[in-house]
């Protein structure tokens, strides 16, 4: 007998063909021999089955000797063996209806787990294979679990259910609620304006919640809340902002903050958290601020950086157009009795300049 797999909520068409291409008597029955539909004269008639309001036939193909049964809005309990009686012969078709759903909301925070549950008819033994948008393959039986969702898991998951060498494909849209970046670092010279941006990795029609930026300055013993804000339907309103520094925040997404000037006392790390309405847990993004200062005091030319820098970063003092250079994998470099001219202080990572500050040394007579 023929096996057909269907998807819960979908429509399936079971086919039955007569040997002659002409309109003739036919009946579709279920395994209990209850008539579902058939032909009487030129008209479609329906029997007393539970399917009667969801069953139909493609009448346009009757005169081609094709007597299909279409079942709409499939249910798991529609799984059965259906019998087509035509020209004194019987054709059996086994219909197996499967459903695949996410156990929880399909909008999940990064780090949360996703469980997909397969609904299947009794007696079936299907296997499920799911592929994430990022190409991750997961296999399972009645349930499939993804323990810790990552940003790249956002998008359409394609799941294939296999039974009796037949397959049916499900597509489930999963939205991982996260910031686009887990961490970002801003490099600034002292006195420059600082802009922090926190773009989200998803879009929602209605986005409501509240957030806060906590800041741990390198020079401070404890962290401090710099700003708290509300988000209502994608509109940002500031609730409380510290007096020092006096941050400004944009009223539109993406979340955007400006610091009037980069100062050594602000250098450090921040953690922006966003709690979304009706969601447990918070979205996080780390942001770092590195500040550079180049100064000349008496016979000493110094370049310093504050903030979270990796040990592999190099700090250099270099006289423009000359070979004179002093470099260190440290947070401060200095030159005693520097030559007159334009000196450059450079913070670099494997040759790539991250931050540069120029200071003019005037000759001392």
């Amino acid at each position: 007998k023929k096996v057909v797999l269907g998807k819960k909520g979908d429509t399936v068409e079971l086919t039955c063909n007569a040997s002659q291409k002409k309109n003739t008597q036919f009946h579709w029955k279920n395994s209990n021999q209850i008539k579902i539909l058939g032909i009487q004269g030129l008209f479609l008639t329906k029997g007393p089955s539970k399917l009667s309001d969801r069953a139909d036939s493609r009448k346009s193909l009757w005169d081609q000797g094709c007597f299909s049964m279409i079942i709409k809005n499939l249910k798991i309990e529609d799984s059965d063996t259906y019998i087509c009686e035509v020209e004194n012969k019987k054709e059996e078709v086994e219909l197996l209806v499967f459903g695949l759903t996410a156990n929880s909301d399909t909008h999940l925070l990064e780090g949360q787990s996703l469980t997909l549950t397969l609904e299947s008819p009794p007696g079936s033994s299907p296997s499920v294979k799911c592929r994430s948008p990022g190409g991750k393959n997961i296999q399972g039986g009645r349930t499939i679990s993804v323990p810790q969702l990552e940003r790249q898991d956002s998008g359409t998951w394609t799941c294939t259910v296999s039974q009796d060498q037949k397959t049916v494909e499900f597509k489930i849209d999963i939205v991982v609620l996260a910031f686009q970046k887990a961490s970002s670092t801003v490099y600034k010279k002292e006195g420059e304006q600082v802009e922090f941006s926190f773009p989200l990795a998803f879009t929602l029609e209605k986005l409501t919640g509240s957030g806060e930026l906590w800041w741990q300055a390198e020079r401070a013993s404890s962290s401090k809340s710099w700003i708290t804000f509300d988000l209502k339907n994608k509109e940002v309103s500031v609730k409380r902002v510290t007096q020092d520094p006096k941050l400004q925040m944009g009223k539109k997404l993406p979340l955007h903050l400006t610091l009037p000037q980069a100062l050594p006392q602000y250098a450090g790390s921040g953690n922006l958290t966003l709690a979304l309405e009706a969601k447990t847990g918070k979205l996080h993004q780390e942001v770092n601020l590195v500040v550079m200062r180049a100064t000349q005091f008496q016979e000493n030319l110094t370049c310093e950086v504050w903030g979270p820098t990796s040990p592999k970063l190099t700090l250099s003092l270099k006289l423009e157009n000359k070979g004179a250079t002093v470099s260190k994998q440290a947070k401060a470099v200095w030159v005693l009795n520097p030559e007159a001219g334009m000196w450059q202080c450079l913070l670099s990572d494997s040759g790539q300049v991250l931050l540069e500050s120029n200071i003019k040394v005037v000759p001392t007579w």
């Epitope: 209502k232 509109e235 309103s237 944009g250 539109k252 955007h256």
Partner: antibody, heavy 117, light 107 residues
Framework: EVQLVESGGGLVQPGGSLRLSCAAS????????MTWVRQAPGKGLEWVAN????????YYVDSVKGRFTISRDNAKNSLYLQMNSLRAEDTAVYYC??????????WGQGTMVTVSS | AIQMTQSPSSLSASVGDRVTITCRAS??????LNWYQQKPGKAPKLLIY???SLQSGVPSRFSGSGSGTDFTLTISSLQAEDFATYYC?????????FGQGTKLEIK
């Protein structure tokens, strides 16, 4: 046609009060933030106040805080500005404006408020 | 509050000229800036929103550019009806702030 029509302007003595109204038509009023902007004679534009769709959030320029109140009646498609303790420097044309979220896009013709003894 | 500095305050030009007006924010405001045109006795009219998007119905000779702190309104070829006062508006956060205005006059 999308339209905003202001009314309620006039001459008032310093310390007096006035209530400006704005009738909106041609768009779904309850879906937009609304704004008042003013312009003193011969001067530039000054944003005065904003109100959210449901009236739950209101913002004011510092110079009018505590004296002016912005409000709305979505059932009547109307925006209001209650102005108390008026000063000579409040003399201006007051415009009712629709805030499209990314711009102040539709402006009324304005109503003149003169504060003078 | 973030300050907006518009320049020049006045400008003389002729029909057919290319004209540029600038607006500078005291702090970064992304692209949250609009440009308006106002003629005497009339309400302002929106020309450009989100720094560079042309408002529907506005002639393509008007264009906007910039982001962060520096913004520009350009009229590629002045027409007689373009002589008016132009204002920039920061709608990055509250309070909204207008520039001081640029009066564009016929030379």
């Amino acid at each position: 046609e999308v339209q905003l029509v202001e009314s309620g302007g006039g001459l008032v003595q310093p310390g007096g009060s006035l209530r400006l109204s704005c009738a909106a038509s041609g768009f779904t009023f309850s879906s937009y933030w609304m704004t008042w902007v003013r312009q003193a004679p011969g001067k530039g534009l000054e944003w005065v106040a904003n109100i959210k769709q449901d009236g739950s959030e209101k913002y004011y320029v510092d110079s009018v805080k505590g004296r002016f109140t912005i409000s709305r009646d979505n059932a009547k498609n109307s925006l209001y500005l209650q102005m108390n303790s008026l000063r000579a420097e409040d003399t201006a044309v007051y415009y009712c404006v629709r805030d499209r979220y990314d711009a102040l896009d539709i402006w009324g013709q304005g109503t003149m408020v003169t504060v003078s003894s | 509050a973030i300050q907006m500095t518009q320049s020049p305050s006045s400008l003389s030009a002729s029909v057919g000229d290319r004209v540029t007006i600038t607006c500078r924010a005291s702090q970064g405001i992304r692209n949250d800036l609009n440009w308006y045109q106002q003629k005497p006795g009339k309400a302002p009219k929106l020309l450009i929103y989100a720094a560079s998007s042309l408002q529907s119905g506005v002639p393509s000779r008007f264009s906007g550019s910039g982001s962060g702190t520096d913004f520009t309104l350009t009229i590629s070829s002045l027409q007689a009806e373009d002589f008016a006062t132009y204002y920039c508006l920061k709608d990055y956060n509250y309070p909204y702030t207008f520039g001081q205005g640029t009066k564009l006059e016929i030379k």
